[in-house]
Each structure stands twice: as structure tokens, then as C-alpha cells.
Interface confidence: low
């Protein structure tokens, strides 16, 4: 055309886009039948003219489907939703080793789409543990392994450990370790780890407790240092002396072994005997002096005191009046306070 400004129309309009294959907004999820309660499986798809469940390769009866259509709030799309119930009886009736499974098939004008398979299993938890923890007595600071193999179950049981009925949290107490095979390890046994330990297995069906294992952390006794030797039993000559130690470093605890060996030692001892001093004989009297006295002396030498023996007691010098010789009566008398009646003082001999 020659009209400028007029719009040129296409010879033909493109056809509307083809409807896409159905897309699942919700696929059926694995489920467990607890006791006799049936499970619900649910599918949501868009766009979908029909949705049906297929279980174990066979179509589920149309009557067993509950179907509804509505707007998806999140997308504003018109979606189709379907749900079925699966009973315990249906699952039990499936013979063979395969699990009971269901999947959705959705149709649109573009074709069909299959959802994932959802497996339906009968949940259970057997009563007996495959392995239960054993009580044990362990030395202080040693590593302890408590084993637990939970009962067989579907779904597989989760395991937790109790210490005196409190749940052990290894992130709070790093002395505890939980291994992937459900064992409990006490890294270094402390006295406070003396306790009752229980393995607990639980799943959606039940909770089972193992027998309780008592762990006793013991301390073997250790000797204290030896005390000083006692004095020799005899003050003089051959005797005995002893020393002792006690099983207190540490003292045995929680059934730990008592110390091995002797708590006391005895040994012979010889003490050199003390010799008490004794006087020699008195000397002869001296001549009469100008002081009208004469004298005699003796010594603590028969024998002298030895090895801590006692000194002699008594006087070293003895004097008495005399009137012969050079005596002058007007001189000092024996009653004079400065009289030379001397006593031994200490170990000095005075003359």
C-alpha cells in the first residue's frame, strides 16, 4: 500500500504456544504406616487435564482418587490435585521383596509426566537390641567404649545415650564421643563419669531402652612418701628403727586396688652407748697453808663422760682446817664466804 503511516498486517498470526508438559508442584513423598493408620499420598500438577496414581505398576481405581482443582496461591496458576490413601493391608498384601511404591502420572495436551516414586513402608521397631552396652570398671583417665546396636526398625532408629537419665550431648561435653555406629566413647574417664549409661533407640513407632550399663571409674591406690625413721628402740647398743607410709597418694577409690608392697620398713640400728663420768681417787692432802687450810683434789676422769654420758656430780676440791705449818690464825677461816669449797661448773675444772 501507498498510505504512509498505515500499519502493515502480517499475512497470518502465529499460532498460540503449545500447552507444555505437566509440571509437578508437589510429588508424592515416602511415607510410613504407623500401627494401622493409613497414609495419604498427594500430587499437584500444572497444566493437567488428568492425574492418576499408579502403585506397583498398576493403576489405582478411579474411585480411590480424591481430585480437586484450584488456584495455586503462590503462582496464580490453575492446578489439579489428587490424593489417595494406602492402607496397611494393601502394603502387607504386596508379596515379594520389593517395597510398596506409588507414583503420579499427569496428562496435558502435550503429553504425560511421571512423578518420582514414593515408597510406603510399614513402620516398626523391634524390641531387642542387637547389642547392648556392658557395664565395666575402668581406671581413671582411661578411654571407655560402650557399644550399642539398636533394634532393627523402619525407619532406621535414631540413637541417643543417657547418663543417669540425662541425654549426653557431645557438643557440650567433649569428653564424650558418639560414633556413626552408635557407640559411646568416654575419651578420658573421670570420677564424675561413674554412672549408669543407657542406649535409647527411637523412631516414629516407638522408643526402646537398652539394659543399663554401670560404668565405675576406679582409682588404684598409691603410696605416700616414707615418713622419717623412728629413733632406735634401744638407747644403747643394738636395736630397731622403723618408718611408715600410707596408701593415700591417692587413696583407692570405687574398688581400685590397694597399694602393693609394705606399709612399713624395719631396720637394725646400733647406738653407741653413753658412758657416765666417774671420779678418780682423792689426791693426798696438801701441806697446811698460810690460810690454815689444806687441800685435796680429784678429777672426773675415771672414766670421763663419753657419747653423751652424764658428768660427775660433786666437788673437785676438798679442804679442811689445819693449825700446823705456816698457819696464821688471824687469816681467813673456812667460814669465810670466799672459802674455796668449789663445785664443778659445766665441764671446767677449777683449781
Amino acid at each position: 500500500g501507498t498510505d504512509s503511516g498505515s500499519e502493515v498486517l502480517p499475512d497470518s498470526f502465529p499460532s498460540a504456544p503449545a500447552e507444555p508438559l505437566p509440571y509437578f508442584l508437589q510429588e508424592p513423598q515416602d511415607a510410613y504406616i504407623v500401627k494401622n493408620k493409613p497414609v495419604e499420598l498427594r500430587c499437584r500438577a500444572f497444566p493437567a487435564t488428568q492425574i492418576y496414581f499408579k502403585c506397583n505398576g498398576e493403576w489405582v481405581s478411579q474411585n480411590d482418587h480424591v481430585t480437586q482443582e484450584g488456584l495455586d496461591e503462590a503462582t496464580g496458576l490453575r492446578v489439579r490435585e489428587v490424593q489417595i490413601e494406602v492402607s496397611r493391608q494393601q502394603v502387607e498384601e504386596l508379596f515379594g521383596l520389593e517395597d510398596y511404591w506409588c507414583q503420579c502420572v499427569a496428562w496435558s495436551s502435550a503429553g504425560t509426566t511421571k512423578s518420582r516414586r514414593a515408597y510406603v513402608r510399614i513402620a516398626y521397631l523391634r524390641k531387642n537390641f542387637d547389642q547392648e552396652p556392658l557395664g565395666k570398671e575402668v581406671p581413671l583417665d582411661h578411654e571407655v567404649l560402650l557399644q550399642c546396636r539398636p533394634p532393627e526398625g523402619v525407619p532406621v532408629a535414631e540413637v541417643e545415650w543417657l547418663k543417669n537419665e540425662d541425654v549426653i550431648d557431645p557438643t557440650q561435653d567433649t569428653n564424650f564421643l558418639l560414633t556413626i555406629d552408635h557407640n559411646l566413647i568416654i575419651r578420658q574417664a573421670r570420677l564424675s563419669d561413674t554412672a549408669n549409661y543407657t542406649c535409647v533407640a527411637k523412631n516414629i513407632v516407638a522408643k526402646r531402652r537398652s539394659t543399663t550399663a554401670t560404668v565405675i571409674v576406679y582409682v588404684n591406690g598409691g603410696w605416700s612418701s616414707w615418713a622419717e625413721w623412728s629413733p632406735c628402740s634401744n638407747r644403747c647398743g643394738r636395736g630397731w628403727q622403723k618408718r611408715t607410709r600410707t596408701c593415700t597418694n591417692p587413696a583407692p577409690l570405687n574398688g581400685g586396688a590397694f597399694c602393693e608392697g609394705q606399709a612399713f620398713q624395719k631396720t637394725a640400728c646400733t647406738t653407741i652407748c653413753p658412758v657416765d663420768g666417774a671420779w678418780t681417787e682423792w689426791s693426798k692432802w696438801s701441806a697446811c697453808s698460810t690460810e690454815c687450810a689444806h687441800w685435796r683434789s680429784r678429777e672426773c676422769m675415771a672414766p670421763p663422760p663419753q657419747n653423751g654420758g652424764r658428768d660427775c656430780s660433786g666437788t673437785l676440791l676438798d679442804s679442811k682446817n689445819c693449825t700446823d705449818g705456816l698457819c696464821m690464825q688471824n687469816k681467813k677461816t673456812l667460814s669465810d664466804p670466799n672459802s674455796h669449797l668449789l663445785e664443778a661448773s659445766g665441764d671446767a675444772a677449777l683449781y
Partner: antibody
Framework: EVQLVESGGGLVQPGGSLRLSCAAS????????IHWVRQAPGKGLEWVAY????????YYADSVKGRFTISADTSKNTAYLQMNSLRAEDTAVYYC????????WGQGTLVTVSS | DIQMTQSPSSLSASVGDRVTITCRAS??????VAWYQQKPGKAPKLLIY???SLYSGVPSRFSGSRSGTDFTLTISSLQPEDFATYYC????????FGQGTKVEIK
Amino acid sequence: EVQLVESGGGLVQPGGSLRLSCAASGFNISYSSIHWVRQAPGKGLEWVAYIYPYYGYTYYADSVKGRFTISADTSKNTAYLQMNSLRAEDTAVYYCARGYGIDYWGQGTLVTVSS
Amino acid sequence: DIQMTQSPSSLSASVGDRVTITCRASQSVSSAVAWYQQKPGKAPKLLIYSASSLYSGVPSRFSGSRSGTDFTLTISSLQPEDFATYYCQQHYSLFTFGQGTKVEIK
């Protein structure tokens, strides 16, 4: 004082056998986990085997399963590693060690597998 | 089997530097991770156990932390005696070591 002393290393031909010993002192191996860990020349650490003697509880690395056997004689306070069908790639320093977070190690013993 | 991916494989640093080594577990290992230091010709030495517990006798400049399946060893101020190779190890399901990180002098 805790000590671990390995012995028994040496030169052996491929296909041959060797028995390593780990003598422990300062603690009772009955109540601890004992490991063998190896280190090939210039390479990193590789865990080999584990025993908890109180239970006779043992584990092995896939690389040695069926060829190596870990054992313990608690009366001698000693752990062992029996190595059979040795290969060139088993050449390494073998360490004996104690505990889950391994707190004590021996000084190591060299095993050379070569023709 | 659980893999422990350690990084970097080597690093150069100076005395006084802050050094960080990481290990990633291929699946959850709780806090069951230990860190070791090894010097040439010597046996490894335990530094950290249970992800963040400092082993007795180890200087406080060493620390460990956990975030999910990521584990970190930090040396707050590198000392001359810290130049060595460091290994992580998980002991949650059997035992696996990381490949090692060599800390060298810059």
C-alpha cells in the same frame, strides 16, 4: 609416663610378610584404642588399622583389608600388625598410636617393600 | 567413606602472622575432629581434639572451631617453632586424615 615403641620394620620383597610390634608403657592397652597409621615417603598420614583390645574390636582401611591383621597381647601390653602380601605402595613409616583423638604416638618404624 | 578435604596444601607466612587452615568433611562428623602438627622426621603431635578443645601443654595461640562440616585450625600469632605440616583427622566414622598443609617461612 606414656610411651609407645614400634619395632619389626625392615626391607621385604613384594608378596612377603612382616610383623610390627608396638610395646606400650605407662597405660593399660586393654582400655584404650590402638591404631597403626602410616606415612609414605614425602606423603601425608594414612590411617591403617585399629583395635580396642578389651573387646577384640578391630577396623581396617580398605587399602589393607584382607592383607593386614591387627592384634594385641594384653599380658605383654603390646599391639601387633601382621602384614601379608606386601606391595611396593605399602612402603612407609608405620606409627603406633593411642586414642580416638590420637594423643600419643610412637617414633615410627620404616617398612620398605622392594625387590 | 568420609573424606576430609584440607586447604591450602601449603602456605607461606611470617612470624607474627595469623594463619588459618581449613578442613571440610564430606558428611557430618559431629565435632569428632582432631588437628595434629608434624615436623620432618618426627611423629605427629596432637594440638586440638573434639574440634575445639586445646590439648594439654599446647600453647593457647592454637585454636580450633567448627561450622557444620567445616573445621578450622587457627594460629593467632605464628612463632618460629610453628613452621611444620598440619593435619586434620575425623574420628566419627572410622578415621580419615586430611592431605596436610605445609606452613613455610615467607
